[in-house]
């Protein structure tokens, strides 16, 4: 043999009961002691520290705390050092060391020791993970190391959680004993937080101990709080709320179009949108997720706003006789009333649509001009002006003429045309053509579709020549011999040099 001891590293017992600490020891056979003595020390193995003597086989002298409360159950001669401690009180909790005394110089304190824990509540063992819908086993374990007093177990608050199974007295790895009772049940999410109790009672005594455990039932999230569809005016503040019930608390995520906007581990999560814009209109999803499952719900946010400035797509330059198609579109919520005007005359209108098509078949020069597209809803009105340019061959207006005044002849040629034409004055009798580029003789001025050209001839009043006005653009040419009017009929103002 060799020096060594075997005892449970830890042992527990209820306050007021007793405890038997099983203990065996060994020593070298050649020491052959005539008598084996032993000492149990409390809390320190060093005799120099004068630890309290729990038991000493050589004498009856023990520390006052252990007076009448300690007894050796084992036979030291048989290398059994089992100790019995009675009427346990909290201050007896601690380390217990055995010292073998074989006489001579052979006293040996074993480093192996027992830690006694004086308890006053049964130990309810709940698995580290209790999941809703999955059967669980909860056990109540109490020490049963007092040969004089045996505990009886009962469950408290287990109604609806199944009937207990009593396993009885079980031996643990290190030689200590426990009484065990089991409870099997399938927890629901409602069982989370349920307080389950176990009672250990000692028959024929008033000793009774209770312990409780709160069930921590894990379950997947269910979204229980969520806005129904939300309408908000552009520029206002919007708060979307998502609340979920789960254990552990879920990771709540607000998403839009697959993009995470906000997330947090919480039971509820607000998504605050400051000064909402139409861009934020759409479907928002809340995802609640924990290790046990997930749930998701969506909410539609409608941002109400005045129409945007309409945009005009389509033909803005057309040739006389063509069909013109113009699309006016905008964006608003709700959809607007769209109207196209020309000179306060409604040409087309549509209600609660975001676009309006204007069709002008076979345009005439009269269709040329400024148009307005107006979009309107209860939040505002916006308008966009656009010009339709109708292109056509020149038309020399009948107001074109020549007139004499003192010694000067002035010829006025007024042409309506798009695009701007060229104008030339022809004097056939003289075989002369004067172009508008000859600024000495011709003055031209354009106003809208009208081009007014004035030819001034000096010293021609007595015998005025014939004058033909010819106007040309890419669509055609028109010529007109300008009628001559008397002085009394000529009413014009000279503009320019």
């Amino acid at each position: 043999g060799h020096w060594g001891a075997w005892m449970p590293s830890s042992i527990s017992a209820f306050e007021g009961t007793c405890v038997s600490i099983p203990c065996r020891f060994d020593f070298p056979d050649e020491l052959r002691p005539a008598v084996v003595h032993g000492v149990w020390y409390f809390n320190s193995p060093y005799p120099k520290n004068y630890p309290p003597v729990v038991f000493k086989s050589r004498t009856q002298v023990v520390h006052e705390s252990f007076q009448g409360r300690s007894r050796l159950l084992g036979d030291l001669g048989l290398r059994n050092c089992t100790l019995l401690l009675s009427t346990l009180s909290p201050e007896l909790g601690g380390k217990y060391y055995f010292r073998g005394d074989l006489g001579g110089y052979n006293q040996y304190t074993f480093s192996e020791h027992s830690v006694l824990d004086i308890i006053n509540t049964p130990n309810i063992v709940v698995p580290p993970e209790v999941v809703a819908g999955t059967e669980v086993e909860v056990s109540c374990m109490v020490p049963d190391n007092c040969p004089e007093l045996r505990p009886e177990l009962s469950w408290l608050g287990h109604e609806g959680l199944g009937e207990p199974t009593v396993l009885g007295r079980l031996r643990e790895d290190e030689g200590t004993w426990v009484q065990v009772s089991l409870l099997h049940f399938v927890p629901t999410r409602e069982a989370n937080g349920h307080r389950l109790g176990c009672q250990a009672a000692f028959p024929n005594t008033t000793l009774q101990f209770e312990g409780y455990a709160s069930l921590d039932v894990k379950y997947p999230p269910v979204i229980v709080e969520m806005n129904s569809s939300v309408e908000a005016i552009e520029g206002s503040h919007v708060s979307l709320l998502c609340g979920a019930d789960s254990n552990p608390p879920p990771l709540l995520t607000w998403m839009r179009d697959g993009m995470v906007l906000r997330e947090a581990v919480a039971e509820s999560l607000y998504l605050d949108l400051e000064e909402v814009t139409p861009a934020e209109d759409g479907i928002y999803a809340c995802l609640a997720e924990n290790a046990y499952g997930q749930d998701n719900r969506t909410v539609e946010l409608s941002v109400m706003y005045a129409p945007w400035k309409p945009t005009v797509n389509g033909t803005v330059v057309a040739v006389e006789g063509e069909t013109v198609s113009i699309l006016c579109s905008t964006q608003s919520n709700p959809d607007p009333i769209l109207t196209i005007f020309k000179e306060k005359q409604i040409l087309a209108t549509v209600i609660y649509e975001s676009q309006l098509q204007l069709e002008l078949p076979a345009v005439t020069p009269e269709d040329d001009g400024e148009y307005w597209c107006v979009a309107e809803n209860q939040y505002g009105q916006r308008a966009t002006a656009f010009n339709l340019s109708v292109e056509f061959a020149p038309i020399i207006l009948l107001e074109s003429h020549c007139a004499a005044a003192r010694d000067t002849v002035q010829c006025l040629c007024v042409v309506k045309s798009n695009p701007e034409p060229s104008v030339a004055f022809e004097l056939p009798s003289r075989n002369v053509t004067v172009n508008e580029t000859e600024r000495e003789f011709v003055y031209s001025e354009r106003s809208g579709l009208l081009l007014t050209s004035i030819l001034t001839l000096r010293g021609q009043a007595q015998a005025p020549p014939r004058v033909i006005c010819t106007s040309r653009n890419l669509y055609g040419t028109q010529s007109l011999e300008l009628p001559f009017q008397g002085a009394h009929r000529l009413m014009w103002a000279k503009i320019g040099p």
Epitope: W3, P33, G103, Y105
Partner: antibody
Framework: QVQLVQSGSELKKPGASVKVSCKAS????????MNWVRQAPGQGLEWMGW????????TYADDFTGRFVFSLDTSVSTAYLQISSLKAEDTAVYYC???????????????????WGQGTLVTVSS | DIVMTQSPDSLAVSLGERATINCKSS????????????LAWYQQKPGQPPKLLIY???TRESGVPDRFSGSGSGTDFTLTISSLQAEDVAVYYC????????FGQGTKLEIK
């Protein structure tokens, strides 16, 4: 040099008590155990027990429990043997003897007695 | 307890001659953990305390003349004085210190 000097001879009546001292010098007192050995007139040596001078813990041989007490005063490096209720058969020379102790952790190993005191004769007679 | 028995009880040897004292233990004093014999020899002259001669069965204490030697193992041990000197007249004790300490009854050595 190592010296163990014991107190002088004692003549005591039966039933009385006696206290023998053993003063150590020339070494560290608490590094060695102190043994007590009895030698009755014309007889052999009898080991009475020893006291651990470091811990103060006494160990008594089976024949020397009850009336015999070992004690220490480490401040003056002195060990004491007290015998109470003296009997005629306690008449003997009492020796103190040191033994080396090798400490390791909470335990130790004791070795042979190497130095002895000169002895104290205790005579018990009415 | 381990009982130590010495032989002879007394011994007379001429000066310069070898003296041999035997000691037998009731149980082995060889300690398995360090393979040492926990046996010592003491010399005691009249009116003096015992003096350590040998320990570990064969290790001579410092200052002890080399004519003293010890041998043996387990249960049988011998103290040998190779050449007896007049000052060697004394009582010799064997002593085991493995278990509860015990001494032999002593051997008285005289000059023949």
């Amino acid at each position: 040099q190592v010296q163990l000097v014991q107190s002088g001879s004692e003549l005591k009546k039966p039933g009385a008590s006696v206290k023998v001292s053993c003063k150590a010098s020339g070494y560290t007192f608490t590094n060695y155990g102190m043994n007590w050995v009895r030698q009755a007139p014309g007889q052999g040596l009898e080991w009475m027990g020893w006291i651990n001078t470091y811990t103060g813990e006494p160990t008594y041989a089976d024949d020397f429990t009850g009336r015999f007490v070992f004690s220490l005063d480490t401040s003056v490096s002195t060990a004491y043997l007290q015998i109470s209720s003296l009997k005629a058969e306690d008449t003997a020379v009492y020796y103190c003897a040191r033994n080396p102790i090798n400490y390791y952790g909470i335990n130790y190993e004791g070795y042979v007695m190497d130095y002895w005191g000169q002895g104290t004769l205790v005579t018990v007679s009415s | 307890d381990i009982v130590m028995t010495q032989s002879p009880d007394s011994l007379a040897v001429s000066l310069g001659e070898r003296a041999t004292i035997n000691c037998k233990s009731s149980h082995s004093v060889l300690y398995s953990s360090n393979q040492k014999n926990y046996l010592a020899w003491y010399q005691q002259k009249p009116g003096q305390p015992p003096k350590l001669l040998i320990y570990w069965a064969s290790t001579r204490e410092s200052g002890v003349p080399d004519r003293f030697s010890g041998s043996g193992s387990g249960t049988d041990f011998t103290l040998t004085i190779s050449s007896l000197q007049a000052e060697d007249v004394a009582v010799y004790y064997c002593h085991q210190y493995l278990s509860s300490l015990t001494f032999g009854q002593g051997t008285k050595l005289e000059i023949k």
